[in-house]
């Protein structure tokens, strides 16, 4: 867990000719506010896609009235930082959108009017706990200068906020195998409580015994890279022998949305539509008041003076959702089926279908295996709108053309050591265990508990798994 912090330094005309007109006037005084939207990874996503890492709205800036005849100066800014709390690990790579909004304070019927002045976006790499990073972005004739950083909330530390720190139990040193927590040298790393074997680079845990994967990794121990899987289904879990993602539960199975939120699948993941009073990626944030600025895109917050009374966001035209977080466009009606991506071409809508689907609305499930060949003795398996090759041992990938590492999923039980072999894998069992995967304990009286060792092999000898 941690907080992404954004400090806006200035917003004003950029260099060069064509200075923008001041957004405010004596007749129409206005003030600025900012919205930041964060998404994990470096994906090129539409501005309207969910802010999966979180979003924040600044306070309103001071009222500004243009001086007649004067060029537009840097405009007065709201005080303070924009802070976006993140609950899980910091992904290290992220995309951001920063919007500059104008609130007009003239005699508007029905209250103030909001309009988007500028939107900048970018993709960055950032380690948590590092120094402030400075940036300049231009949107048309406007220029935005800002700094940002990600910091972990105690007891989390590290570049991804996945290591936990605890105060030292002894004054001089940390316990065995535990390092001091830089920069908190008076604290020690907490003992690892994740599931045994959980990848330290690609996995993390918040509860003892669990192993949750960072974006781009899957499998029970977060050791299988999603990107190298060539199976076409975007769903986990992983297949131990092929390193390939096989169709599994959908992102909405088991409803990841808390507090009565409803889940809908998106081309990349899922989206929660939260009931009033809750927001966040999984509707996990509650106790929100209007003072927290929960209404995005210029939505007007009503009620919610204290955490026990729900707020209501009155959305400006063109936005919807309990927090006005969703832009209403012609793709909002979700014409594309089976995870197809909707593209508004202006004169018409088009669906870009996921592999294995076709038709104007991606409504046709293709004959998955027609004309498909699986190499190296693999067989084609239909299902889920995307053909999948069930590969022979030692091979993986979409068409079984890649050599697979059969040991990647740590198949040898009870501390057995795995060796890749031309025909699969070999487990060298720890003393006291036997079996192809070292799954059977050897009884003290010398009899094994099923099955008997093949002739010529002593318990504990490496056995080839065919």
């Amino acid at each position: 867990a941690g907080v992404f912090e954004l400090q806006i330094h200035s917003f004003g005309p950029g260099p060069g000719p064509g200075a923008p007109r001041s957004p405010c006037s004596a007749r129409l005084p206005c003030r600025l506010f900012f919205r930041v939207c964060l998404k994990p990874g470096l994906s090129e996503e539409a501005a309207e896609s969910p802010c999966a890492l979180g979003a924040a709205l600044s306070a309103r800036g001071p009222v500004y009235t243009e001086q007649p005849g004067a060029p537009a100066p840097d405009l007065p800014l709201p005080d303070g930082l924009l802070q976006v709390p993140f609950r899980d690990a910091w992904p290290g790579t992220f995309s951001f959108i920063i919007e500059t909004w104008r609130e007009e304070l003239g005699d508007q019927i029905g209250g103030p009017a909001w309009s988007l002045l500028a939107r900048v976006a970018g993709r960055r790499r950032l380690a948590a706990g590092g120094p402030w990073a400075r940036d300049i972005q231009r949107a048309g004739a406007w220029e935005l200068r800002f700094s940002y950083r990600a910091r972990c909330e105690p007891p989390a530390v590290g570049t991804a906020c996945t290591r936990l720190c605890r105060p030292r139990s002894a004054p001089s040193r940390c316990g065995p195998g535990l390092r001091p927590c830089a920069p908190l040298e008076d604290e020690c790393e907490a003992p690892l409580v994740c599931r045994a074997g959980c990848s330290p680079e690609h996995g993390f845990c918040e509860q003892p015994g669990e192993c949750r994967c960072l974006e781009g990794w899957t499998g029970p121990l977060c050791t299988v890279p999603v990107s190298t899987s060539s199976c076409l289904s975007p769903r986990g879990p992983s297949s131990a022998t092929t390193g390939c993602l096989v169709p599994g539960p959908g992102p909405c199975d088991g409803n990841p949305c808390a507090n009565g939120g409803s889940c809908s699948e998106t081309p990349r993941s899922f989206e929660c539509t939260c009931p009033r009073g809750f927001y966040g990626l999984r509707c996990e944030v509650s106790g929100v008041t209007c003072a927290d600025g929960p209404c995005f895109n210029g939505g007007l917050c009503v009620g919610g003076a204290d955490p026990d009374s729900a707020y209501i966001c009155h959305c400006p035209p063109g936005f919807q959702g309990s927090n006005c977080e969703k832009r209403v466009d012609r793709c909002s009606l979700q014409p594309c089926r089976n995870g197809g991506l909707c593209l508004d071409l202006g004169h018409a809508l088009r669906c870009r279908c996921r592999a294995g689907f076709a038709g104007p609305r991606c409504e046709h499930d293709l004959d998955d295996c027609a004309g498909r060949a699986c190499a190296n003795g693999g067989t084609c398996v239909e299902g889920g709108g995307a053909h999948r090759c069930s590969c022979a041992l030692g091979f993986g990938g979409r068409d079984c053309r890649e050599r697979a590492d059969p040991c990647a999923a740590r198949p040898c039980a009870h501390g057995g050591r795995c060796y890749a072999h031309f025909s699969g894998l070999v487990c060298a069992c720890a003393p006291g265990y036997m079996g192809a995967r070292c799954e059977f304990p050897v009884h003290p009286d010398g009899a094994s508990a099923l099955p008997a060792a093949p002739p010529g092999l002593r318990p504990g000898d490496p056995q080839r798994y065919l």
Partner: antibody, heavy 120, light 107 residues
Framework: EVQLVQSGSELKKPGASVKVSCKAS????????MNWVKQAPGQGLEWMGI????????IYNHKFKGRFVLSVDKSSNTAYLQISSLKAEDTAVYYC?????????????WGQGTTVTVSS | DIQMTQSPSSLSASVGDRVTITCHAS??????MGWLQQKPGKAPKGLIY???NLEDGVPSRFSGSGSGADYTLTISSLQPEDFADYYC?????????FGGGTKVEIK
């Protein structure tokens, strides 16, 4: 032949609710959105909202949020408009009109209209 | 919301006349608009979609043109059955909006 057949006229008291139906035939119901349009006596047309029958996703005109609910029953190829807490100003003819979900043709086929009269 | 300003609000014409109705959108709508015909006591009927395309079964004397924010419906030779109300509608952006209507009456 494409047809949209709406339910009959309704006379309701203020505060009551009404549910207008629009039964579609002659085309694949889930391939076309359904729009609802209001026409008050002697007035022009006013768009109320739209529903995707395949997914049930709706978008409302912000003037018609709250008391107005659009829904569909895919098994009977029927779209519904429900209005609760009726007021005198809800007196109007309500039309359903289909619209292609991708090519965005304008509303090419319309129901015959359902007159809703709200009077005490 | 996009405003659709239709003119004239009414016109009188004779059979055989060429009639032109215009619609101006408060912002560009890229041809995402249509024209509807409504006769008294009847439901509207689609005439034109995408600014210039005739709906199935609509006589060729009806035509649509325009781009950006300005669009025109033309009836090249008015027929007795064409006396009705005509509406433009934009479907570029939610909420969809209609013009105020043009009543075409017999002179």
């Amino acid at each position: 032949e494409v047809q949209l057949v709406q339910s009959g006229s309704e006379l309701k008291k203020p505060g009551a609710s009404v549910k207008v139906s629009c039964k579609a035939s002659g085309y694949t119901f889930t391939d076309y959105y359904m729009n609802w349009v209001k026409q008050a006596p002697g007035q022009g047309l006013e768009w109320m909202g739209i529903i995707n029958p395949y997914s049930g996703v709706t978008i409302y005109n912000h003037k018609f949020k709250g008391r107005f609910v659009l829904s569909v029953d895919k098994s009977s190829n029927t779209a519904y408009l429900q209005i609760s807490s009726l007021k005198a100003e809800d007196t109007a003819v309500y039309y359903c009109a289909r619209q292609d979900s991708l090519l965005d043709y304008a509303m090419d086929y319309w129901g015959q209209g359902t007159t809703v009269t709200v009077s005490s | 919301d996009i405003q659709m300003t239709q003119s004239p609000s009414s016109l009188s014409a004779s059979v055989g006349d060429r009639v032109t109705i215009t619609c101006h959108a408060s912002q560009g709508i890229s041809g995402n608009m249509g024209w509807l015909q409504q006769k008294p006591g009847k439901a509207p009927k689609g005439l034109i979609y995408h600014g210039a395309n005739l709906e199935d079964g609509v006589p060729s004397r009806f035509s649509g043109s325009g781009s950006g924010a300005d669009y025109t419906l033309t009836i090249s030779s008015l027929q007795p059955e064409d006396f009705a109300d005509y509406y433009c509608v934009q479907y570029a952006q939610f909420p969809y909006t209609f013009g105020g209507g043009t009543k075409v009456e017999i002179k």
